[in-house]
Interface confidence: medium
């Protein structure tokens, strides 16, 4: 089942990336270097999707920058296939599933003076299920309320306050949001959740509710990158990968993150009996992508050099802000009760003892199905 997941894995986009750019991981590193001691959390598939959607209305070098930045080699597949691929993916992701909440969406808020091209609006709706809203940015408080209320409604109140402030000179604001909450295939026993120390640094220790469960997990020890990786399946197709770097090795692991590394992990997993200790946490990431994407070569679209003639006839239109917010909750709930009783762990004869894996220092996490839904670093649960 894990092998199937490897074969089906599309990293960051539904088209085979060219070797020039590893978009997902380059974006991760850009976010990490911008705020080294912060937690990071974003959805590569969701951001790729919104950029691909934007490329629908971009022309010449602006379009090329977006597609190359995404690492897409369009000799291998036509643009039409790219958009169709995302359309299919969106339909799959938005399908209601038991024990699986996923709200993913894109919206374009444009100044009242901007006339949108009908072809762009209909392509956005058809392919990306995206909405467009005329917005009075002169009333920045009202505009901000309009955007935040829209996202809160779409995510059933799970993502609120997407925007904290707003520039009244904005012309186009692109919003991309994703919320995920799913049930584990096997739940963690609530009785096993206890307050434990989490070492943010060797000097900074915080108390966190630590879930625990002994079970067979997909596990591997990556000696090259100095980390341990465990896969915890959700109900359905998704799996959470938790990566615990050895002490002092977080940067080494971050530098080694790549599509190849992820494929290797998924391929090399072995089923192992583990005593897994994992903090119960909710993590969110909110990013102004117009500040980060230029370092990945996607810059035109945010400047006066933007060619967005496919979006509007307005000659000087550019994307003022591109906001992405991703939220995930991790708790004990599962679709199947864990086999544990009130006694959490008992020691048996030496060799039968399962290995303890305690996520009590900063770690990385992926949530993958056939794509990387999320990628993050938990510095402080």
């Amino acid at each position: 089942e894990m092998k199937k997941r490897v074969e089906d894995l599309h990293v960051g986009a539904t088209v085979a990336p060219s070797s020039r750019r590893d978009f997902t991981f380059d974006l991760y590193r850009a976010l990490a270097s911008a705020a080294p001691s912060q937690s990071i959390f974003f959805s590569p598939v969701s951001i790729s999707m919104s950029l691909a959607m934007l490329s629908l209305g971009a022309g010449s070098s602006t379009k090329m920058q977006i597609l190359e930045g995404l690492g897409l080699n369009l000799q291998k597949s036509s643009e039409k296939e790219l958009h169709r691929g995302f359309q299919q993916l969106l339909q799959e992701l938005n399908q209601p599933r038991d024990g699986f909440q996923l709200s993913l969406g894109n919206a374009l808020f444009t100044d009242l003076v901007v006339d949108l091209q009908d072809t762009f609006v209909s392509a956005m709706k058809t392919l990306y299920l995206a909405d467009t809203f005329p917005t009075n940015f002169r009333d920045s408080a009202g505009a901000m309320k309009q955007i935040n209320d829209y996202v809160a409604k779409q995510t059933k109140g799970k993502i609120v306050d997407l925007l904290k402030n707003l520039d009244s000179n904005a012309v186009v604001i692109m919003v991309n949001y994703i919320f995920f909450k799913a049930k584990w295939e096997t739940s963690f026993n609530h009785k096993g959740t206890q307050e434990q120390d989490f070492y943010v640094t060797s000097e900074t220790v915080v108390r966190v509710p630590m879930m625990s469960r002994e079970d067979q997990y997909h596990y591997l020890l990556d000696r090259n990158l100095s980390c341990r990786v465990v896969g915890v399946p959700y109900q359905g197709n998704a799996t959470a990968l938790f990566i615990l770097p050895s002490e002092g090795k977080m940067q080494q692991v971050e530098n080694g993150l790549s599509e190849k590394t992820l494929r290797k992990w998924l391929k090399m997993f072995k089923k192992r009996q583990l005593e897994l200790y994992l903090p119960k946490f909710s993590i969110e990431g909110s990013y102004q992508l117009e500040k980060v994407l230029p370092s990945l070569g996607i810059s035109n679209v945010f400047t006066s050099h933007a060619d967005l003639s496919g979006i509007s006839n307005h000659s000087n239109i550019q994307v003022s802000e591109m906001v992405h917010k991703a939220v995930v909750e991790v708790d004990e709930s599962g679709t199947r009760a864990a086999a544990a009783t009130g006694t959490i762990f008992t020691f048996r004869s030496a060799r039968l003892n399962s290995q303890r894996l305690v996520f009590n220092r900063p770690f990385l996490m992926f949530i993958v199905d056939n794509n990387i839904l999320f990628l993050g670093k938990v510095n402080r649960p």
Epitope: L221, M268, K270, Q273
Partner: antibody, heavy 119, light 111 residues
Framework: QVQLQQSGAELVKPGASVKMSCKAF????????IEWMKQNHGKSLEWIGK????????NYNEKFKGKAKLTVEKSSSTVYLELSRLTSDDSAVYYC????????????WGQGTSVTVSS | DIVLTQSPASLAVSLGQRATISCKAS??????????LNWYQQKPGQPPKLLIY???NLESGTPARFSGSGSGTDFTLDIHPVEEEDAATYYC?????????FGGGTKLEIT
Amino acid sequence: QVQLQQSGAELVKPGASVKMSCKAFGYTFTTYPIEWMKQNHGKSLEWIGKFHPDNDDTNYNEKFKGKAKLTVEKSSSTVYLELSRLTSDDSAVYYCARGHDYDYGMDYWGQGTSVTVSS
Amino acid sequence: DIVLTQSPASLAVSLGQRATISCKASQSVDYDGDSYLNWYQQKPGQPPKLLIYGASNLESGTPARFSGSGSGTDFTLDIHPVEEEDAATYYCQQSNEDPPTFGGGTKLEIT
């Protein structure tokens, strides 16, 4: 209980090949790797390679690449070691063993297969 | 490859006394606080038998008179009190890095 059963002794001519087997009993075959060792008469042990039935992963000691080949028959929980282009240096006892869960050595061993290369 | 050097090559110990075997690695066999160093016992005509794994953990079935210690590059196997049935060759083995390697062996004779 856990047991690894190896095929019988072999007497082979130089230049020929030999294929020996290691059949696992008493545990879930796909959970643990099977490792192979060579022991020259009265000498220490050398690791040849390992096969992980869980994902068909094979690892070889650089020294034995081109000499040794590991294959599997999952239906019978059997791993095979084939040695090619045999010389007198290949005369030894070959052991298969079950690799431990977390890379902590090998916890169960076969009885060994003695290979003698002689014309 | 990591080279493991065992000493002494052979050892004669009286019944009831202590036998100490040393194993030195050419580089550390530790990973993330764990030592990937194992000890085996081999008797003539038999396969090796795992005694101790992870430097100091007794494999189930290993008598308590066997103990292992050490970390990094220096490891020791102790047998006390030595019994008649402990006459065998002892090997250390590292599993921290591929290829796994074995020490040259120490032959223990009981007098």
